[in-house]
Each structure stands twice: as C-alpha cells, then as structure tokens.
C-alpha cells in the first residue's frame, strides 16, 4: 500500500509547479561560499522535496542542500566558480525540475552596514558614509550601491542615487529644512559578476537643521 501511496504522491508532484530561484554569496564566511534556493510558489508542499547541485564543483560531483524551513541552503568551499552547475529539485532519486546555472551570475552581495550621515555646517551639506564587507573580498569586490532616502512623512517618495564608492554628499538645499529623513543603502555586483540587489542596510534617521540653524553636526535619532 505504501508503494501505491508513494507513486500517487509522485504523480501528484509532477502536476505541481516546482519553479525555483537561487542566489549565491561568495566568500560569505571566510573562504566559504553559500547558495540559497527557494520555491517561487510559497504553497508548494516541500515535505519530501530535496535540492541537489551537480557539476562545476571541486572534489565532489554533487552536493545536497540543507533544508531550513522554506529555504534550501549550502555553505561550502567546493564551488568551482567556472562553468554551469545543474541544480535539481528531487523526490528521492527522481528529478522533478532542473536548471543549469553559473553561480557567478546569481550573486547577491551582503548588505552594506554602518550607514551614517554627518552634517557639515560650513559646506551646507550632508556626508553619507557606509561600509561593505566586499572591500576585503577576493572575488566580488566591485559593487554598484543604491542609496535611497525619503522624508519620513512621504511614505513612498524615495529618492535614489547610484554610486560606486561608499561616500555620498547630499546638498542641504536639495532637502527640506527641519525635517526627519530616513536613508538606507543596498548593493549589486557591477563588474564581471552578475546577480541581484542585496538586502537593504538598516535604515539611518537624521533631521535636517532649521534654515538658519548653526548646530554643526546633526544628531542621529
């Protein structure tokens, strides 16, 4: 009976949509790389489903993912980073769907951090600085950053600035006086590697001075 049940499960499984997406993070933990995959349909029953990557690996032909709630995850040094790997969704030994992917084309950088804003009274501007772990990496060193800021009362009116450095100057006259602003930053690979935007950094909140205010450095909130 269990044999019939398993066959039935498999037949049902073949009717489902097992579309999935993945992103890689290179040198995310020392020299270790990671690969994260998830189903695009959140309602997929993942009980018996596994992910496997084969090809373009060092010292092994295939690796199995670990399941962490709704996501599937590998952390390893064994990505060759040359050529395409075959990533498959499997039930037992049967592959339900596969994708051939070059892991260097699905890179998601780590989120920037240490975002801060300093007001320069003499220059009448704001210096935005942040940090990224990618400055120390061997592979994904060159990033494009997207700094987004908005007046706190304007729910969806974000202003975006793209830059390749980790420092940005905002002119005081471009901002509203005596207003509270929220600012955040994210990154995407910009040289050789391809992929996706990182998560946003934690937001930083700052208040612009009154028009004739001479307070010097602004206070973060």
């Amino acid at each position: 009976e269990s044999g019939y049940a398993q066959n039935g499960d498999l037949e049902d499984a073949e009717l489902d949509d097992y579309s999935f997406s993945c992103y890689s993070q290179l040198e995310v933990n020392g020299s270790q790389h990671s690969l994260t995959c998830a189903f695009e349909d959140p309602d997929v029953n993942i009980t018996n489903l596994e992910f496997e990557i084969c090809g373009a690996l060092v010292e092994v032909k295939c690796l199995n993912f670990r399941k962490l709630q709704e996501i599937y995850f590998i952390e390893t040094k064994k990505f060759l980073l040359i050529g395409k790997s075959n990533i498959c969704v499997k039930v037992g030994e049967k592959s339900l769907t596969c994708k051939k992917i070059d892991l260097t084309t699905i890179v998601k950088p780590e989120a920037p951090f240490d975002l801060s804003v300093v007001y320069r009274e003499g220059a009448n501007d704001f210096v935005v600085t942040f940090n990224t772990s990618h400055l120390q990496k061997k592979y994904v060193k060159v990033l494009m950053h997207d700094v987004a800021y908005r007046q706190e009362k304007d729910e969806n009116k974000w202003t975006h600035v793209n830059l390749s450095s980790t420092k940005l100057t905002l002119l005081q006259r471009k901002l509203q006086p005596a207003a509270m602003y929220e600012i955040k930053v994210r990154s995407i690979p910009d040289h050789y590697f391809k992929g996706f935007w990182s998560e946003w950094s934690p937001s930083y909140y700052f208040r612009t001075p009154e028009i004739n205010n001479s307070s010097g450095e602004m206070d973060p909130i």
Epitope: G55, T105, F193
Partner: antibody
Framework: EVQLVESGGGLVKPGGSLRLSCAAS????????MHWVRQAPGKGLEWVSL????????YYADSVKGRFTISRDNAKNSLYLQMNSLRAEDTAVYYC??????????WGQGTLVTVSS | NFMLTQPHSVSESPGKTVTISCTRS????????VQWYQQRPGSSPTTVIY?????PSGVPDRFSGSIDSSSNSASLTISGLKTEDEADYYC?????????FGGGTKLTVL
C-alpha cells in the same frame, strides 16, 4: 551551427611571440567558458588555459604560466592567447574549445604553432 | 596533481567489443566527472562521453562510459566495433581549475 575558427599560428623563433585568435559563432559566446588545448606533433592532448564567461577567472597549465595570457572580447565573440617567450616545446596544434554544459563539446580545427630557429 | 593513465594502444576486430581504461594515480576517480574524446586522424577531438556516462546527441549508443571506484578508474566501452571507430581516445577530468588529460589510447580496428 557552432563554429570555432582559430588563426594566428605560424613559424616563430625561440623567445618570440605570437597571438592566437579564435572566432566563435553559432552559440552564446558570452555565456561560455573557453579553453585552449594543444597537441604536439604525434603526441596527446595537453590543456593550456581557460577563461570564465566574463574574463575574471583565468587559469593556466604550469608549463605556460607567466608566458601565456588568455583573454576574450565578448563584443567580438573572440578568444585570444598571447604567447610570449616561446620555446621549442611549445610547438603544437592549438585548439580552442567551448565548455558549454560539458567541456569540449565543440572544438576548432586548430592552428599550428612552430617554434624553431 | 594527479595523472590519468591509459593503455597506449588496443586493437580488436569489427563487430567485437573493446574497453579502454583510464586510471587515476591519486585522489578519487569519483571526485569529478570523466569525459572521453575521440580524435580521428587529421581531425579535431570530439566528445563521445561526458559526465562519466552521458552521450552527446549524435553519438551512437555503442559507446558507453562507466566508473569503477574499486580500481579508481573510468572505462570507455565500444560495442559492435566499426572501422570508423579507429581513432585515438582520451579521458579527461577536472583538477580544481585545471584539466587533466589521459595520455591517449590508439584504437585499431583490425
């Protein structure tokens, strides 16, 4: 139809230089890892070098490291091998090969490099 | 670095079956996929087996590949030999970012 056409081979004196080219067509070149493999007269295949789809990753056999440079121009669908400080033992037919989903499913016809005084 | 060792030559009659071995000197044969190439005289190499036992389209099913962990070797088997199979055959494996070729085996169809 996939085509790889090597050129640039010829006779060169020891210590001299040559630049080999490989013109690719019939596939998505900028999605493919590319290799150079050589074969000395009457001998077996010897891997020389590879370059990733983007040009970032380049690797070389110990026998050519520091003398040969692999590069690519994705806009021109072309692969190159700059060979400096050539030696007699570099005499061989040089093939470019497309890795695709598995190494060597497509090879060029080869270009002969002869190093002799 | 490891080496891949093949017999220098093998010969067999048309219609028969021949097996060419490829033995890895150190490290496991299972650690990366094996490919096999056929090179006819005066021609470029072509892939006959990839990923240990997979045949590219257009390669007849007379060609098969296998791995034997106990002998740390790979094998290419050609059944129903034809005169057109006369060629040099090379095995290949990745070694990190390098490719390692076997020395080649000359197959003569008598």
């Amino acid at each position: 139809e996939v085509q790889l056409v090597e050129s640039g081979g010829g006779l060169v004196k020891p210590g001299g230089s040559l630049r080999l080219s490989c013109a690719a067509s019939g596939f998505t070149f900028d999605d493919s890892v590319m290799h150079w493999v050589r074969q000395a007269p009457g001998k077996g295949l010897e891997w020389v070098s590879l370059v990733g789809w983007d040009g970032f990753f380049t690797y070389y056999a110990d026998s050519v490291k520091g003398r040969f440079t692999i590069s690519r121009d994705n806009a021109k669908n072309s692969l190159y091998l700059q060979m400096n400080s050539l030696r007699a033992e570099d005499t061989a037919v040089y093939y470019c090969a497309r890795q695709g989903d598995y190494m060597g499913n497509n090879w060029g016809q080869g270009t002969l490099v002869t190093v002799s005084s | 670095n490891f080496m891949l060792t093949q017999p220098h030559s093998v010969s067999e009659s048309p219609g028969k079956t021949v097996t060419i071995s490829c033995t890895r000197s150190s490290g496991s044969i299972d650690s990366s996929y094996v490919q096999w190439y056929q090179q006819r005289p005066g021609s470029s190499p072509t892939t006959v087996i990839y990923e240990d036992d997979q045949r590219p389209s257009g390669v007849p099913d007379r060609f098969s590949g296998s791995i034997d962990s106990s002998s740390n070797s790979a094998s290419l088997t050609i059944s129903g030999l034809k005169t057109e199979d006369e060629a040099d055959y090379y095995c290949m494996q990745y070694d990190f970012h390098h490719l390692v070729f076997g020395g080649g085996t000359k197959l003569t169809v008598l």
